[in-house]
Amino acid sequence: MMTGTIETTGNISAEKGGSIILQCHLSSTTAQVTQVNWEQQDQLLAICNADLGWHISPSFKDRVAPGPGLGLTLQSLTVNDTGEYFCIYHTYPDGTYTGRIFLEVLESSVAEHGARFQIP
């Protein structure tokens, strides 16, 4: 039975040209995290494997930095970075947990963080 929940940074906004940290946190389970995948829509951004560490897709290595923790830092943001991001936690024995973050990249300097929310 999957008892865990994923807490994410929720709906967030950031300025064009700036950076943002995408964070997810798995709680309420004792399951072992074996791998965390980060996706933007259907594209793989990065993998953090418990044994091997980080793998950053060559398509994004200019603008994506691993961490902090199991999170991901996006740099040199453009308006095209606006959209859904997913953290996919592979765990044993529970299975897979998925968290969703929506990022809006703004042209203006008014870019405020949204509230945190939970996805069961």
Epitope: L44, N49, G53, P58, I88, H90
Partner: antibody, heavy 121, light 113 residues
């Protein structure tokens, strides 16, 4: 040690499809990318794409999108490549390779012996 | 796509001779964040699969003799064999793994004069 065992040679008709296999041994199959490389006499080596069995992620060279489909079966530790709508241009040796992970990703330290595909009517 | 160009396409040599072959890329393979060149060299003998010789432009794969040396940075790379042995006769390919799609050079064939 790491080994990649490929399926045998194929003689196929134009317009049909072929599916070849690459069975991995000696490492954790889900942890490393598996790539595919085409080799034709006079054309050198061409990277087709790769797959990450630990998530099913794939990358393709644009010129092989619609031609090649990469899949992996974690239970049998086997990667597959299907080639469709075959023509004489698809006659080649197809190698599977260990594509690495993270800081070892992108260069190929282990190669399969290759599967020879001959397209002929 | 990054285009990889190798020269010469054929390289006649004598055993014991020092040889160099060139590989040029249409874009820099040096990644500023880690200061690494994303370039590999392979050797392919007749009837065999290619074998990795060099990665990160200059790091020898385990078991590769030190008479083979990779050098260069950015867009210009060189593979040097300090004293050719008969067993070195093969085709040598360079490959970039900096950006998708990964691409290979056309190869340099090392052959006896």
């Amino acid at each position: 040690q790491v080994q990649l065992q490929q399926s045998g040679a194929e003689l196929v008709r134009p317009g049909t499809s072929v599916k070849m296999s690459c069975k991995a041994a000696g490492y954790t199959f889900t942890n490393y990318w598996i790539g595919w490389v085409k080799q034709r006499p006079g054309h050198g080596l061409e990277w087709i794409g790769d797959i990450y069995p630990g998530g099913g992620y794939t990358n393709y060279d644009e010129k092989f999108k619609g031609k090649a489909t990469l899949t992996a079966d974690t239970s049998s530790r086997t990667a597959y490549m299907q080639l469709s709508s075959l023509t004489s241009e698809d006659s080649a040796i197809y190698h599977c390779v260990n594509g690495g992970y993270g800081s070892t990703y992108g260069y190929f330290d282990v190669w399969g012996a290759g599967t020879t595909v001959t397209v002929s009517s | 796509d990054i285009v990889m160009s190798q020269s010469p396409s054929s390289l006649p040599v004598s055993v014991g001779e020092k040889v160099t072959m060139s590989c040029k890329s249409s874009q820099s393979l040096l990644f500023s964040s880690d200061q690494k060149n994303y370039l590999a060299w392979y050797q392919q003998k007749p009837g065999q699969s290619p074998k990795l010789l060099i990665y990160w432009a200059s790091t020898r794969e385990s078991g590769v003799p030190d008479r083979l040396t990779g050098s260069g940075s950015g867009t210009d790379f060189t593979l040097t064999i300090s004293s050719v042995k008969a067993e070195d006769l093969a085709v040598y390919y360079c490959q970039q793994y900096h950006k998708y799609p990964f691409t290979f050079g056309g190869g340099t064939k090392l052959e006896i004069k």
